[in-house]
Amino acid sequence: QSPPGKPEIHKCRSPDKETFTCWWNPGSDGGLPTNYSLTYSKEGEKNTYECPDYKTSGPNSCFFSKQYTSIWKIYIITVNATNEMGSSTSDPLYVDVTYIVEPEPPRNLTLEVKQLKDKKTYLWVKWLPPTITDVKTGWFTMEYEIRLKSEEADEWEIHFTGHQTQFKVFDLYPGQKYLVQTRCKPDHGYWSRWGQEKSIEIPNDFTLKD
């Protein structure tokens, strides 16, 4: 039996700059029941606060609701582990909410096979930004990637589309079924997970409909 090992805050993420969660790895418990508490202060403030919500985001986590989240202040966060034999504290972690955004994937992915005047066929992929992001006001600047592959293929073909919410894919094989997904990344944050997969078959005998 021994004091607990040093915990480590290993991840903090925000879906929208309005709430965020931090998760920690507990370290060894020293063979004893061990309690964990997350405490934080904010830049320029002397006060220290305890985690407002240990439940919402699951075990070994702290959820900061809107009421506790500010993008104007840096959070200095530590996790303390305590058992009968002693205690141990993580290294402090400095968190700027602007830099931990991992948004939801883009929504309303639509796929349409189109044809140019020269009869060249292409796949027109369109989508919308995730619901929660206020892209119009510049609060978020979002970049996008799409990936596609034919059902038979092993590898995805990835296209970076910049800030565009549509993309044209040429040189696709007629008769093949293609799977498509999109993801997004805010200017200072992390890529979202890949969104829901959509599929479309490229017709063998595509003719332009009026």
Epitope: E8, K11, E43, I71, V95, D96, K185, Y190
Partner: antibody
Framework: QVQLQQPGAELVRPGTSVKLSCKAS????????MHWVKQRPGQGLEWIGV????????NYNQKFKGKATLTVDTSSSTAYMQLSSLTSEDSAVYYC???????????WGQGTLVTVSA | DVVMTQTPLSLPVSLGDQASISCRSS???????????LHWYLQKPGQSPKLLIY???NRFSGVPDRFSGSGSGTDFTLKISRVEAEDLGVYFC?????????FGGGTKLEIK
């Protein structure tokens, strides 16, 4: 505690390439972005670029595009920077540096001195 | 790129004196989120740089309160109220509001 270990020095020939390493320990490697910074002898610091080890997303200073390539090996918690077509202008100390979830550098490696000489 | 200009280049001081270093940026350093990402680092001889001040005026963990930062827009200052021997080295200002992040040329604090 967080440590970033870099080899002390590399002597390389002009026109060749060199791959610098930065072995991270004391934290979850994939959770924090890794930056690289150049310092020429007696001069200031230049930010080269950054890599997100969780998905290898990179962002380069335009000045170093084509010169530096950032990669990671998550199995060994090591970040790499390859410098190509070396000239005397590339002789410098190169640091890897980690931020927290912020845009400054909280932890620095000791730096690798690269000397380009025939 | 944002150019960071530090003055003076060299600052000879006596131990116990106050020291002041200026840093001027070629563009305003207010980020779209309202924060000003101007930081100060100290590099002691033979060592890697270490963070002293983040976001203009916030002392990093373990940094003595004799260090203070101030400023806004394009003009920033680092002050050391009573210089100690361990403060000697090269001080760099740095901005991370605009990509690429850039550094000042450095100010060498040395004994008079």
């Amino acid at each position: 505690q967080v440590q970033l270990q870099q080899p002390g020095a590399e002597l390389v020939r002009p026109g060749t390439s060199v791959k610098l390493s930065c072995k991270a320990s004391g934290y979850t490697f994939t959770s924090f972005w890794m930056h690289w910074v150049k310092q020429r002898p007696g001069q200031g610091l230049e930010w080269i670029g950054v890599i997100d080890p969780s998905d290898t997303y990179t962002n380069y200073n335009q000045k170093f595009k084509g010169k530096a390539t950032l990669t990671v090996d998550t199995s060994s918690s090591t970040a790499y920077m390859q410098l190509s077509s070396l000239t005397s202008e590339d002789s410098a100390v190169y640091y890897c540096a980690r931020g927290d979830y912020s845009n400054w550098f909280t932890y620095w490696g000791q730096g690798t001195l690269v000397t380009v000489s025939a | 790129d944002v150019v960071m200009t530090q003055t003076p280049l060299s600052l000879p001081v006596s131990l116990g004196d106050q020291a002041s270093i200026s840093c001027r940026s070629s563009q305003r350093l207010v980020h779209s989120n309202g924060n000003t990402y101007l930081h100060w680092y100290l590099q002691k001889p033979g060592q890697s740089p270490k963070l002293l001040i983040y976001k203009v005026s916030n002392r990093f963990s373990g940094v003595p309160d004799r260090f203070s930062g101030s400023g806004s827009g394009t003009d920033f200052t680092l002050k050391i109220s009573r210089v100690e021997a361990e403060d000697l080295g090269v001080y760099f200002c740095s901005q991370s509001t605009h990509v690429p992040w850039t550094f000042g040329g450095g100010t060498k604090l040395e004994i008079k």
